[in-house]
Amino acid sequence: ARNGDDCPLGPGRCCRLHTVRASLEDLGWADWVLSPREVQVTMCIGACPSQFRAANMHAQIKTSLHRLKPDTVPAPCCVPASYNPMVLIQKTDTGVSLQTYDDLLAKDCHCI
Amino acid sequence: ARNGDDCPLGPGRCCRLHTVRASLEDLGWADWVLSPREVQVTMCIGACPSQFRAANMHAQIKTSLHRLKPDTVPAPCCVPASYNPMVLIQKTDTGVSLQTYDDLLAKDCHCI
């Protein structure tokens, strides 16, 4: 699979990690998260042209079949390959606790 | 997360497992796979409306941010949650071998 820098569609247009700033209100978390007030959400965004960052053989098949049957089979999709744990200070019944979420922030991306 | 049967967009339109019939030629495998001549490829296809089959917290965040910034943040995408192994009879330098691929056929789907 090609790496993230040689996107055939032009620089930065293919599947890669982006950071989107979001408030607790944006995320619908204002009623249970105390801190941080704003989150730098890392997510996978971008196109998945042929064999670009293909996660596995399924992604390769998907590319081939999308080429043949574009109306039936979608192109591979840019999704997290792994995550960074994220710590939140949140409200609990008994007060405040430190809670870590494993599946919140994308760490790197691939096409599947 | 809602299960696969209560798609708010109408029956069968949300993220679920589909089977697509493909020949070795379709897949670009004709020069290295001997059998089967045709593959029933199971793949994940369909829309991912709000919280439908959300894989994790990242998917929930993506839904929230897509609602706020649809031009920047894509909706979650329907991808395999797990795979079924598939056995192929393939050509090798020395003749023929039986090879199992773990990441070829989708077993079930979720939105991420």
Epitope: S35, P36, R37, V39, N84, P85, V87, I89, Q99, T100 | -
Partner: antibody, heavy 118, light 107 residues
Framework: QVQLQQPGAELVMPGASVKMSCKAS????????MHWVKQRPGQGLEWIGV????????SYNQKFKGKATLTVDESSSTAYMQLSSLTSEDSAVYFC???????????WGQGTTLTVSS | DIVMTQSQKFMSTSVGDRVSVTCKAS??????VAWYQKKPGQSPKALIY???TRYTGVPDRFTGSGSGTDFTLTISNVQSEDLAEYFC?????????FGGGTKLELK
């Protein structure tokens, strides 16, 4: 550059209280949380708790509830930890450490050596 | 509380060697593990977070790996300045807990 300054030592009588400081510089104080960690001589590290420097929310290790109280003074970019009802078990080095949502404990102070003795 | 076990209290090495410090969690902590280096009389220095991500400025001879319950800090091409104590820490669930430390010494 990021710096967390702590006094080198404190000598306190048993039964008394002590309030140790941790002065931050080189970054925006309220952008990060402040954690406190204990190290007894010849032993490992123990996490005491954390304070959100902008809102003063605190979360403690159950073991240190009632023993440690974390506070901040935004105006001087200083975090404080008060330890009460001191005994010889509280004699240790206490570190403050800057923390975030992903980077955990990325910068540490030099530590304050607390000696509880009569 | 989650117990982090560093079974080797001491490890002997030589300059230029490759050494692996291990850490075992008493339950699954995902990748919420950090590694620190501590020299006598100094404050801990953060090396790795999220099990495998190096902090800015940490030499690339330090590599973290693992997930779930088993974690490793590998130092390739050990330098004299790497002789120190190494601690793992989990931040998967509160209270955060540290391993007992592994001291790296010269053979």
């Amino acid at each position: 550059q990021v710096q967390l300054q702590q006094p080198g030592a404190e000598l306190v009588m048993p039964g008394a209280s002590v309030k140790m400081s941790c002065k931050a510089s080189g970054y925006t104080f309220t952008d990060y949380w402040m954690h406190w960690v204990k190290q007894r001589p010849g032993q490992g590290l123990e996490w005491i708790g954390v304070i959100d420097t902008s809102e003063s929310y605190t979360s403690y290790n159950q073991k240190f509830k009632g023993k440690a109280t974390l506070t901040v003074d935004e105006s001087s970019s200083t975090a404080y930890m008060q330890l009460s009802s001191l005994t010889s078990e509280d004699s240790a080095v206490y570190f403050c450490a800057r923390g975030g949502t992903t980077v955990v404990l990325d910068y540490w102070g030099q530590g304050t050596t607390l000696t509880v003795s009569s | 509380d989650i117990v982090m076990t560093q079974s080797q209290k001491f490890m002997s090495t030589s300059v230029g060697d490759r050494v692996s410090v291990t850490c075992k969690a008493s339950q699954n902590v995902g990748t919420a593990v950090a590694w620190y280096q501590k020299k006598p009389g100094q404050s801990p220095k953060a090396l790795i977070y999220s099990a495998s991500t190096r902090y800015t400025g940490v030499p690339d001879r330090f590599t973290g790996s693992g997930s779930g319950t088993d974690f490793t800090l590998t130092i390739s091409n050990v330098q004299s300045e790497d002789l120190a104590e190494y601690f793992c820490q989990q931040y998967s669930s509160s209270p955060w807990t540290f391993g007992g430390g592994t001291k790296l010494e010269l053979k």
